[in-house]
């Protein structure tokens, strides 16, 4: 999935792996690997729930849809799918639930037609910054990826590296600006506490962004301004307390957007006034009549659309001498 600019550096380091494991694949064009099911008519290979520990080397050249789900792959090395001739037709690759904890630089190189990649439900403790770009060049050749599904890839707490998980994922998304053509990005159920501010600005082609079921508290530093093609933004089941004016204006300015905000712990105090006003006027929020307050206690379960400015007050901050314990 890369061009010369994005390959030379990563491939030189991966040559020993390739020489031993890939060069020796039987070059038969249409055989079906052991433990897999193949349909040439459907251009599909399924190696599902077979406890495979590595990617089969003898994948048929016709494969367009490859399912490698429910296996025990553990590590995806550089050139894991590199074959000669390349798997030039492979467009959709599903690796979900295959116990991957490491994806190395250049793992998806030499898949020139790869449009859809699903790595969901793998505990990715180590996702190389160059997993998708294949290169440590500042600007890589464009990846053909259009859909990247990364739902529930957060590893257990004790398996995480001593670094920000959000930062690791974002580094892989932004490396070499290779994913400029990405249209769908799903990052649901990853315990994200924040969204690094530069990530969306560098994914200008996004149509669909799913950040549901995370732990996002605020979108204050996130800019949606560049995402002029964005059609759906899923923010359900996060920890959002309020959306501020800047965010509201940016969302309203996106011509095709639909926003999903259900099941967030909205704090209905004086800071919520702008959002309530906006909700009453906007058409971009789907199911806006379902949004309810979580705090303060007296406002719990009140419907946001039914609130008025008199309902949204902030208790005065008392000077320390008057505060009670």
């Amino acid at each position: 999935s890369s061009s010369p600019t994005s390959s030379a550096s990563s491939f030189s380091s991966s040559a020993p792996f390739l020489a031993s494991a890939v060069s020796a694949q039987p070059p038969l064009p249409d055989q079906c690997p052991a433990l897999c099911e193949c349909s040439e008519a459907a251009r599909t290979v399924k190696c599902v729930n077979r406890n495979l520990t590595e990617v089969p080397t003898d994948l048929p050249a016709y494969v367009r849809n490859l399912f490698l789900t429910g296996n025990q792959l553990a590590v995806l090395p550089a050139g894991a799918f590199a074959r000669r001739p390349p798997l030039a037709e492979l467009a959709a690759l599903n690796l979900s639930g295959s116990r991957l904890d490491e994806v190395r630089a250049g793992a998806f190189e030499h898949l020139p037609s790869l449009r859809q990649l699903d790595l969901s439900h793998n505990p990715l403790a180590d996702l190389s910054p160059f997993a998708f770009s294949g290169s440590n060049a500042s600007v890589s050749a464009p990846s053909p990826l259009v859909e990247l599904i990364l739902n529930h890839i957060v590893p257990p707490e004790d398996e995480r590296q001593n670094r920000s998980f959000e930062g690791m994922v974002v580094a892989a998304l932004l490396a070499g600006r290779a994913l400029q053509g990405l249209r769908r990005l799903e990052l649901a159920s990853n315990h994200f506490l924040y969204l690094p501010r530069d990530v969306l600005a560098q994914l200008p082609s996004l149509r669909h962004l799913d950040l549901s079921n995370n732990s996002l508290v605020s979108l204050t530093y996130v800019s949606f301004r560049n995402l002029t093609h964005l059609e759906s933004l899923h923010l359900e089941d996060n920890a959002l307390k309020v959306l501020h004016n800047g965010t509201l204006a940016e969302l309203q300015g996106l011509p095709h957007i639909r926003v999903f905000l259900d099941n967030n712990p909205w704090v209905c105090d004086c800071h919520m006034a702008d959002m309530v006003t906006w909700l009453k006027e906007t058409e971009v929020v789907q199911g806006k009549d379902r949004l309810t307050c979580a705090y303060p206690e007296k406002m719990r379960n009140r419907v946001l659309l039914e609130l008025n400015s008199a309902d949204l007050d902030c208790d005065p901050i008392l000077p320390p001498s008057l505060q009670t314990s």
Epitope: L18, S23, R84, P85, P112
Partner: antibody, heavy 119, light 107 residues
Framework: QVHLQQSGAELVRPGTSVKVSCKAS????????IEWVKQRPGQGLEWIGV????????NYNENFKGKATLTADKSSSTAYMQLSSLTSEDSAVYFC????????????WGQGTSVTVSS | DIQMTQTTSSLSASLGDRVTISCRAS??????LNWYQQKPDGTVKLLIS???RLHSGVPSRFSGSGSGTDYSLTISNLEQEDIATYFC?????????FGGGTELEIK
């Protein structure tokens, strides 16, 4: 260093067969495929097929199915191509080359074997 | 099969010249394009793989570029030892196919 040594020139009769050899040295023979390429006098190059010495697996250009048969002997690190039912159209220089996925290319070539079909 | 076309079958240039040889594929070959040099004695060498990767031992005056269906080989400073025929080859699909070759000679 990688070296592919091919057998010598052949002058053969129409309708007979010929077997060209390609002895590999300087690398692990079973870790790379061997490709075969045809070049008719004053013409371009035509890919015949490929053999994986490790598995014996082969893949042929449709134009050479039934004409060429590729084999390999791991013990001597030698690949072979047999050409059958020879006609004047088969008069050409035949090259073996090492195929590699690291480079997506044929990175080292034999010196070529001239096959002349004549009565 | 993918057709590879080298429109220029022969090319005359002077020593020190910058020479460009082009190659066109009948469909997008996604950078899987190699260049080979065949000397007058028949020996064949890989020069460039995957559009632009210089093979080990090949002088840096050789370079490759291109994308999609159009590719080129450039010799930046022609030397006597570069007199040869140059072939392009696609490596994306069996059967691998070669261009017809471009013969380079000295003016």
């Amino acid at each position: 260093q990688v070296h592919l040594q091919q057998s010598g020139a052949e002058l053969v009769r129409p309708g007979t067969s010929v077997k060209v050899s390609c002895k590999a040295s300087g690398y692990a023979f079973t870790n790379y495929v061997i490709e075969w390429v045809k070049q008719r006098p004053g013409q371009g190059l035509e890919w015949i097929g490929v053999i994986n010495p490790g598995s014996g697996g082969t893949n042929y250009n449709e134009n050479f199915k039934g004409k060429a048969t590729l084999t390999a002997d791991k013990s001597s690190s030698t690949a072979y191509m047999q050409l059958s039912s020879l006609t004047s159209e088969d008069s050409a220089v035949y090259f073996c080359a090492r195929g590699t996925v690291e480079l997506y290319a044929m990175d080292y070539w034999g010196q070529g074997t001239s096959v002349t079909v004549s009565s | 099969d993918i057709q590879m076309t080298q429109t220029t079958s022969s090319l005359s240039a002077s020593l020190g010249d910058r020479v460009t040889i082009s190659c066109r594929a009948s469909q997008d070959i996604s950078y899987y394009l190699n260049w080979y040099q065949q000397k007058p004695d028949g020996t064949v060498k890989l020069l460039i793989s995957y559009t632009s990767r210089l093979h080990s031992g090949v002088p840096s005056r050789f370079s490759g570029s291109g994308s999609g269906t159009d590719y080129s080989l450039t010799i930046s400073n022609l030397e006597q030892e570069d007199i040869a025929t140059y072939f392009c080859q696609q490596d994306i699909k069996h059967p691998y196919t070669f261009g017809g070759g471009t013969e380079l000679e000295i003016k």
